[in-house]
Amino acid sequence: GVFNYETETTSVIPAARLFKAFILDGDNLFPKVAPQAISSVENIEGNGGPGTIKKISFPEGLPFKYVKDRVDEVDHTNFKYNYAVIEGGPIGDTLEKISNEIKIVATPDGGSILKISNKYHTKGDHEVKAEQVKASKEMGETLLRAVESYLLAHSDAYNEQKLISEEDLGGEQKLISEEDLHHHHHH
């Protein structure tokens, strides 16, 4: 069966900046800003776009050792990210996968709202365990607040322009943004 869940949470960080940090560079940021939640993120295959497989490892003491995520969609225009948990963690005899969608929407006060939808695909007639949904939400909240704190403490991060050389680009010297840098290196 399929079970849908939805949560909304707010952030003081503007949508574009939060998308860059939390979504596009989460692989690098999470182990740095929340080592108690995530120990490492490893790219197994792909370049960050749809089809990319990532292995997220958790520190000792947490219930699961790792999960593997598959990237389904990265929408840079609408700040939307779709991915699925396809292996490890809770995936097993009763749970086939968890599909997730994160949308970051700008708010008039300069902050943002994160709309998070989770779709649990269970095997047969199995139900979804409430504590598992709760743990997943708590993990997401932990990561978000850690990234938020980092961004508040580092006002230049993920919003400044950088001068990069022609060796980096394989072309002429250009002034490009963090987002362009991410596209260049990861897509």
Partner: antibody, heavy 119, light 108 residues
Framework: EVQLVESGGGLVQPGGSLRLSCAAS????????MHWVRQAPGEGLEWVAA????????DYADSVKGRFTISRDNAKNSLYLQMNSLKTEDTALYYC????????????WGQGTLVTVSS | EIVLTQSPGTLSLSPGERASLSCRAS???????LAWYQQKPGQAPRLLIY???SRFIGIPDRFSGGGSGTDFTLTITRLEPEDFAVYYC?????????FGQGTKVEIK
């Protein structure tokens, strides 16, 4: 403008088979889950089956499980419903419906194709 | 599965009047996963409301949705001639996705 056009309906005997098609246009088909919903003559709506973006997850109503198969061809912007072992109670207008993207409400519908199962 | 029961089965009203349609779920519909559709004779259903109370694009503001848990309502504040139709509620919190049996709003 989103357009969904169903075809393949017709008269079939109990135990027979039919394959319905739905041609989609006006949106990026591969980015959306798709569904079949049916409506028996003079009756209400009944969800039949769902297929997610890249066909890696499929779900069926208990009433059709094991008899119907939903599939899609993202290259052809097409959705299909293979119906086997048809019963008289499968007689209905079959609608192809587009999901809003991630959750399961239907923001666009085709006009339907009529399947009549009768001897 | 979640069973949705709509009432009344038929509502006879005049244009300009207010219509209140009820949809009751056999168990709680999580996270407001409830939609309303309108269907006219010979036509496909049309999405009106999703997420209990969010109007779909192009839907007039005389249509509004409300409720939570197991009890939901669709309200049409001033009935226009084109509003006479059958209305269905649908839950999408868990599969199988289910519809109510419909409420027919007819001209008195």
């Amino acid at each position: 403008e989103v357009q969904l056009v169903e075809s393949g309906g017709g008269l079939v005997q109990p135990g027979g088979s039919l394959r319905l098609s739905c041609a989609a246009s006006g949106f990026t088909f591969r980015n959306y889950a798709m569904h079949w919903v049916r409506q028996a003559p003079g009756e209400g709506l009944e969800w039949v089956a769902a297929i997610y973006r890249n066909s890696d997850s499929i779900d069926y109503a208990d009433s059709v499980k094991g008899r119907f198969t939903i599939s899609r061809d993202n290259a052809k912007n097409s959705l299909y419903l293979q119906m086997n072992s048809l019963k008289t109670e499968d007689t209905a207008l079959y609608y192809c419906a587009k999901d809003e993207g991630f959750l399961e409400y239907f923001d666009s519908w085709g006009q339907g194709t009529l399947v009549t199962v009768s001897s | 599965e979640i069973v949705l029961t709509q009432s009344p089965g038929t509502l006879s009203l005049s244009p300009g009047e207010r219509a209140s349609l009820s949809c009751r779920a056999s168990q709680s519909v999580s996270s407001s996963f409830l939609a309303w559709y309108q269907q006219k004779p010979g036509q496909a259903p049309r999405l009106l409301i999703y997420g209990v109370s969010s109007r779909f694009i192009g839907i007039p503001d005389r249509f509004s949705g409300g409720g939570s848990g197991t009890d939901f309502t669709l309200t049409i504040t001033r009935l226009e001639p084109e509003d006479f139709a059958v209305y269905y509620c649908q839950q999408y919190g868990r599969s199988p996705w289910t519809f109510g049996q419909g409420t027919k709003v007819e001209i008195k």
